[in-house]
Amino acid sequence: PEPPTACREKQYLINSQCCSLCQPGQKLVSDCTEFTETECLPCGESEFLDTWNRETHCHQHKYCDPNLGLRVQQKGTSETDTICTCEEGWHCTSEACESCVLHRSCSPGFGVKQIATGVSDTICEPCPVGFFSNVSSAFEKCHPWTSCETKDLVVQQAGTNKTDVVCGPQDRLRA
C-alpha cells in the first residue's frame, strides 16, 4: 500500500507512517513503528502538557513568586498550568499575572466606584454635589452630606466634595 501523506486527527506522520499523538498530561518517549504503538509517559510532578502532542519534555508549572506578591489561585495538574493571582490588597500588572502592584486609593474628594480585584485596580469617581470623601481609601464610597433639616438644625457651613456640611442650631427670634 501507498505510504500516507496525511494522518487522522490526533495522529502525526513520521517515517511515512501515522502515529498516535500523546494525550494531554503525557509526553512522547518513542514514536510508533510498524509493530509498536507510540510510547508516552505521564508528566512528572510540577509539569504539564495541555494539548495532544509529540513533545519529548513536559512544561514546568508556572511559579507564583511570593516575592512578587503572587500566590496560587489554581494548582496546576498534569494537563493544566498553575494559575497565579495576587495577595490581598494587590492586583496583577498584566493579563498573564506575572507580578502585582498595590491597589490604588481614592484621594479625598473621590470615592470608590469599584473595589479592586485580583486582576483589576480600584476605580475612583469624583464625589458629586451632595456627597463627600475626606479620606484616602481603597474601599470608601462618597458619603452623602448630613441632612441638617432632619435633625431640626440649619446649615452653618456648606459642604464640599471633601467635607461634610456643618449643622448648627436655628437662630431663636428675640422678643
Epitope: W52, T80, T82, V119
Partner: nanobody, 126 residues
C-alpha cells in the same frame, strides 16, 4: 462565563486582505490560548490558526501558512487574524475560540477549546 464577538468579515476579491477581530468579555483570558477555526458550506470545521500565551507561540494550518497571521492585544482582550492573498477556497464562516484558564498552549483540535464565538462570514470572489 466568556463571551466572544467576531467582526471584520465580508466580501473581498481574490488576492485581497481582511482582518478579523475577536473581542472577549466576561473573564480575562490572558492565561489562555486562543484560536481561529473555519467551516465552509458542506464541510467539516477545520483549524486555521492558534496563539499561545507562553511567548506567544503560534500554529497555522498548512493551507494558510505564510498568508494568515494571528496576534493578540491582551490590553483589549482581543485576538486578530490578518488574512492576506485570499483565495476563493478561504470562503467560510470563521469562528474564534478560547481555551480555559490554565491552558496556555496553542492547540489545533476543536475539543481542546472551551469557549466559542458565533462566527463571521468571509466570502472570497474570483
Amino acid at each position: 462565563q466568556v463571551q466572544l464577538q467576531e467582526s471584520g468579515g465580508g466580501l473581498v476579491q481574490a488576492g485581497g486582505s481582511l482582518r478579523l477581530s475577536c473581542a472577549a468579555s466576561g473573564r480575562t483570558f490572558g492565561r489562555s490560548a486562543m484560536g481561529w477555526f473555519r467551516q465552509a458550506p458542506g464541510k467539516e470545521r477545520e483549524f486555521v490558526a492558534a496563539i499561545g500565551t507562553r511567548g506567544g507561540s503560534t500554529k497555522y494550518a498548512d493551507s494558510v501558512k505564510g498568508r494568515f497571521t494571528i496576534s493578540t492585544d491582551n490590553a483589549k482582550n482581543t485576538v486578530y487574524l490578518q488574512m492576506d492573498s485570499l483565495k476563493p477556497e478561504d470562503t467560510a464562516v470563521y469562528r474564534c475560540a478560547v481555551r480555559g484558564p490554565g491552558y496556555p498552549s496553542a492547540a489545533i483540535f476543536q475539543d481542546e477549546y472551551h469557549y466559542w464565538g458565533q462566527g463571521t462570514q468571509v466570502t472570497v470572489s474570483s
